[in-house]
């Protein structure tokens, strides 16, 4: 009863002589486990015996024993769901129907599976996509309705015998639904693959060839074109004729339209495979190609460069770069449309031919001002000589030349004068726009290259100017040579080195720092009295009377300058000592008498000593000796001694007379 048995397996299995067959199979017996299984080859039901007749390939019994000759066929199933079978090796005569006779306790069933065994390995089958277009990736599939665990195989792809293995992916299926081996090749066909043979080759595990399938690729592609031109080099002269032919080397599908393009632009009314150009002009020079379209799209040929030859056109000169800076390099380029390119050039500078210059470019490595002017050229090729064009102007720029600083004043210049200087130059390009002066002083803003220095200083030695355009050119500095009266006149003691003592030899020097002109005269003066006209003033033996305020004068042709007054100090021991008495040398007793020790000394007396008529020193040391009240006994001769750092001096004796008062006389 078929309702009691449910089977799943491939309907037909394919193999070849010597290979194997693996039959994936599942079943369900609804009334219990399988008790008996027989595999028949081409079973036929015998109505008489109510049993199946046919070759028994495999038999399993209730006790589970399998005859030894049944090793080639293996039942890999179980008692309730798996009925997988393997035949290894499989033989040609195994072709036909396999009958799986299943028996459970109460039910029986014969399940039939078709087995197709060929004499030789059958070829795989290549499946192509419906359309293949150039450069678009497609997947080619190679399918073989065979797979068996005991017999490994491989599928290899070849394009005209060249392997394409890395882009292929192989998969196998051994399921109850399907048994196959499949290889998928990812492939980007080019137009050159059109019509070429692709092979899928079946190999055994050792790489031995078993069978193959081949297909011819139908690769859709735009027309592939070749362009031919007469003359073949595509070089003609004005007035010649040119023929271009467009040949389609490949097109799939067939082409539909043809057109011609020049420099990328379509030529009107040119829709045949031949392009005839009669009496060409130079304007027809350019890149030509043909374009042919099919359903895939347009295809273009390679470009043909048509060169129409003509004599050079009037030339123009391009200067790199103008204006040019003196000392820089300049390149002149002679530009003239010509075909073929000019082979010879003649160059002109200000209308005069430049000898030895025959190239397209003229290079001047170091430009000088005289290079300025108009440059023109003439180009020449095999077809003739062109005309000289208008030329180009070379402007050579340079800093101002021969810059000088000129003193406008009459010479000599004296300190305090107003000095006018001008900045002169020989030539300049571009024009001078400003001037600079060195040193920078707080002078009037210079304009138009003139500098006025008000009240010129004695020390304004040199002045330089620069004339400036884009650059500044400095003149050599000029010496103003400012003349002035002697400066910094001062008295300087040369000897002695220490202080001056009376009797010393003394020399004074009249110094000055500078004088212009250098020729000078000296004058020494003391208290308005002229003492000498030398630079030195000498005293063989100085006396205190020589002390005083001295000045020296230095004069030149510009003027005279006096030193500051210089005080000459002479040091000497106390002299001219005398004792003066107050109120007089006769004093009445009881009154006051003051004795003063007067002296002349430098430095002043620092210490006094008083002596009496007995040369007895008195205990008094100041300049004044005061006797109060004076007594008659005080009468007598007194003298004093003065001391300074230089020495001592003493006075002569001075007599003091003290007379009695009337009272004393009255008492007597």
């Amino acid at each position: 009863d078929s309702s009691k048995w449910v089977f799943e397996h491939p309907e037909t299995l394919y193999a070849w002589e010597g290979a194997c067959v693996w039959i994936p199979c599942t079943y369900r017996a609804l009334d219990g486990d399988l008790e008996s299984f027989i595999l028949f080859h081409n079973p036929e039901y015998n109505k008489n015996t109510s049993k199946f007749d046919g070759t028994r390939l495999y038999e399993s019994t209730k006790d589970g024993k399998v005859p030894s000759e049944q090793k080639r066929v293996q039942f890999l199933g179980d008692k309730n769901k798996n009925c997988t079978l393997s035949i290894h090796p499989v033989h040609l005569n195994d072709s036909g129907q396999l009958g799986l006779r299943m028996e459970s306790k109460t039910e029986k069933w014969m399940e039939r599976i078709h087995l197709n065994v060929s004499e030789r390995p059958f070829p795989p089958h290549i499946q192509l996509p419906p359309e293949i277009q150039e450069s678009q990736e497609v997947t080619l599939t190679c399918l073989l309705n065979f797979s068996c665990y005991g017999y490994p195989i491989q599928l290899q792809w070849l394009l005209e015998g060249v392997p394409m293995r890395q882009a292929a992916v192989t998969s196998t299926s051994l399921t109850i639904k399907s048994v196959f081996t499949r290889s998928e090749l990812k492939f980007s066909p080019q137009w050159s693959h059109h019509g070429k043979i692709v092979t899928c080759q079946l190999q055994d595990a050792d790489g031995k060839f078993l069978s193959n399938d081949t297909v011819q690729l139908n690769v859709k592609h735009t027309p592939k074109l070749e362009i031919k031109v007469t003359p073949s080099d595509a070089i003609v002269r004005e007035g010649d004729s040119v023929t271009m032919t467009c040949e389609v080397s490949s097109s799939n599908p067939e082409y539909t339209t043809v057109s011609w393009l020049k420099d990328g632009t379509s030529l009107k009314k040119q829709n045949t495979f031949t392009l005839n150009l009669r009496e060409v002009t130079k304007d027809q020079s350019g890149k030509y190609c043909c374009q042919v379209s099919n359903d895939v799209g347009p295809g273009r040929s390679e470009e043909v460069f048509l060169q129409v030859q003509y004599a050079p056109e009037p030339s123009t000169v391009q200067i790199l770069h103008s204006p040019a800076v003196e000392g820089s390099q300049v390149e002149f380029l002679c530009m003239s449309l010509a075909n073929p390119l000019p082979t010879n050039y003649t160059w002109y500078h200000n209308g005069k031919e430049m000898q030895g210059r025959t190239e397209e470019k003229v290079h001047i490595p170091k430009i000088l001002p005289w290079h300025a002017g108009t440059y023109s050229c003439v180009a020449e090729n095999i077809l003739g000589t062109g005309q000289r064009g208008p030329g180009a102007e070379l402007d050579v720029q340079y800093p101002p030349k021969k810059v000088t600083t000129v003193i406008q004043n009459p010479m000599p210049i004296r300190e305090g004068d107003t000095v006018t200087l001008s900045c002169n130059y020989n030539s300049s390009n571009p024009s001078v726009t400003r001037y600079e002066w060195k040193p920078h002083g707080a002078w009037e803003e210079p304009s138009l290259g003139v500098l006025k220095i008000q009240n010129v200083g004695w020390d304004n030695t040199t002045i330089a100017c620069a004339a400036c355009n884009s650059w500044c050119s400095w003149a050599s500095p000029v010496a103003l040579n400012v003349q002035y009266a002697p400066r910094d006149v001062r008295v300087r003691k040369i000897k002695p080195l220490s202080e001056i003592h009376s009797g010393n030899s003394v020399s004074l020097q009249c110094d000055f720092s500078s004088s212009h002109p250098k020729e000078v005269q000296f004058f020494w003066e003391k208290n308005g009295r002229l003492l000498g006209k030398e630079s030195q003033l000498n005293f063989d033996s100085i006396s205190p009377e020589d002390a005083g305020s001295y000045s020296c004068w230095v004069n030149n042709s510009i003027g005279q300058t006096a030193s500051k007054a210089w005080t000459l100090e002479v040091l000497y021991a106390p002299r001219r000592l005398r004792v003066s008495m107050s109120p007089g040398d006769q004093v009445m007793e009881g009154k006051s008498a003051t004795l003063t020790c007067e002296s002349d000394a430098n430095p002043p007396v620092s210490h006094y000593t008083w002596f009496d008529w007995n040369n007895q020193s008195l205990p008094y040391h100041s300049q004044k000796l005061r006797l109060e009240p004076v007594k008659v006994q005080h009468s007598g001769a007194y003298w004093c001694q003065g001391t300074n750092s230089v020495g001592k001096g003493r006075s002569p004796l001075s007599t003091l007379t003290v007379y009695y008062s009337p009272e004393t006389i009255g008492r007597r």
Epitope: L159, E160, G161, V162, P163, R165, Q166, Q190, S192, G207
Partner: antibody
Framework: EVQLVESGGDLVKPGESLKLSCEAS????????MSWVRQTPDRRLEWVAT????????YYSDSVKGRFTISRDNVKSTLHLQMNNLKSGDTAIYFC?????????WGQGTTLTVSS | QLVLTQSSSASFSLGASAKLTCTLS???????IEWYQQQPHKPPKFVME???????YTGDGIPDRFSGSSSGADRYLSISNIQPEDETIYIC?????????????FGGGTKVTVLG
């Protein structure tokens, strides 16, 4: 039995040309792609060129592209390698090899020396 | 760029197991490669093909001691119970076809020495 026999190796000067040949027997020549492989003096193998079974496709290594041309005569079962503008770096033993899925058969090789 | 990298030499004791490595450039790590062996003054001989999953098949006359495996971009040629006659150079190779350009690249070769 597959047999591949190379010939044409020689001593040449840089810039000169030479043509190598390879005679095949023992298999259907027109069914297989064929190649030239060279072995340089430092013993390195370098693939040079391959031609498809009926000659529609030719492939070259970058080092010889534009100088070498591979060709075949399926009637005479012969493979050729035309070498122009030879350089000292082309000095090698040149093997002719049958290309199945891999190089399954090789000739014994012919020696090219490029030296001034 | 398709590149194969091999170590230049390897030494093994007689009877030991040897494992040679051929490494593909990283962007080509899924490619199938071939191993060839070359005795001195002889052409190379196909040894085996190894796929990315390690499955392989060996050429005619190659002993069962030779096997192949794969890991990432590495393809291995293993020789068990190495013998004196296995002392030679082993070179790996790989082919590719990109658009309409076929290329074949060889590794630098590994010189195998059998000690003892």
């Amino acid at each position: 039995e597959v047999q591949l026999v190379e010939s044409g190796g020689d001593l040449v000067k840089p810039g000169e040309s030479l043509k190598l040949s390879c005679e095949a027997s023992g298999f259907t020549f027109s069914n297989y792609a064929m190649s030239w492989v060279r072995q340089t003096p430092d013993r390195r193998l370098e693939w040079v060129a391959t031609i498809s079974s009926i000659g529609s496709f030719t492939y070259y290594s970058d080092s010889v592209k534009g100088r070498f041309t591979i060709s075949r005569d399926n009637v005479k079962s012969t493979l050729h390698l035309q070498m122009n503008n030879l350089k000292s770096g082309d000095t090698a033993i040149y093997f002719c090899a049958r290309l199945g899925v891999y190089f399954d058969s090789w000739g014994q090789g012919t020696t090219l020396t490029v030296s001034s | 760029q398709l590149v194969l990298t091999q170590s230049s030499s390897a030494s093994f004791s007689l009877g030991a197991s040897a494992k040679l490595t051929c490494t593909l450039s990283s962007q080509h790590s899924t490619y199938t490669i071939e191993w060839y062996q070359q005795q001195p003054h002889k052409p190379p001989k196909f040894v085996m093909e190894i796929k990315k999953d390690g499955s392989h098949y060996t050429g005619d006359g190659i002993p069962d001691r030779f096997s192949g495996s794969s890991s990432g971009a590495d393809r291995y040629l293993s020789i068990s119970n190495i013998q004196p006659e296995d002392e030679t150079i082993y070179i790996c190779g790989v082919s590719d076809m990109i658009k309409d350009q076929f290329v074949y690249v060889f590794g630098g070769g590994t010189k195998v020495t059998v000690l003892g």
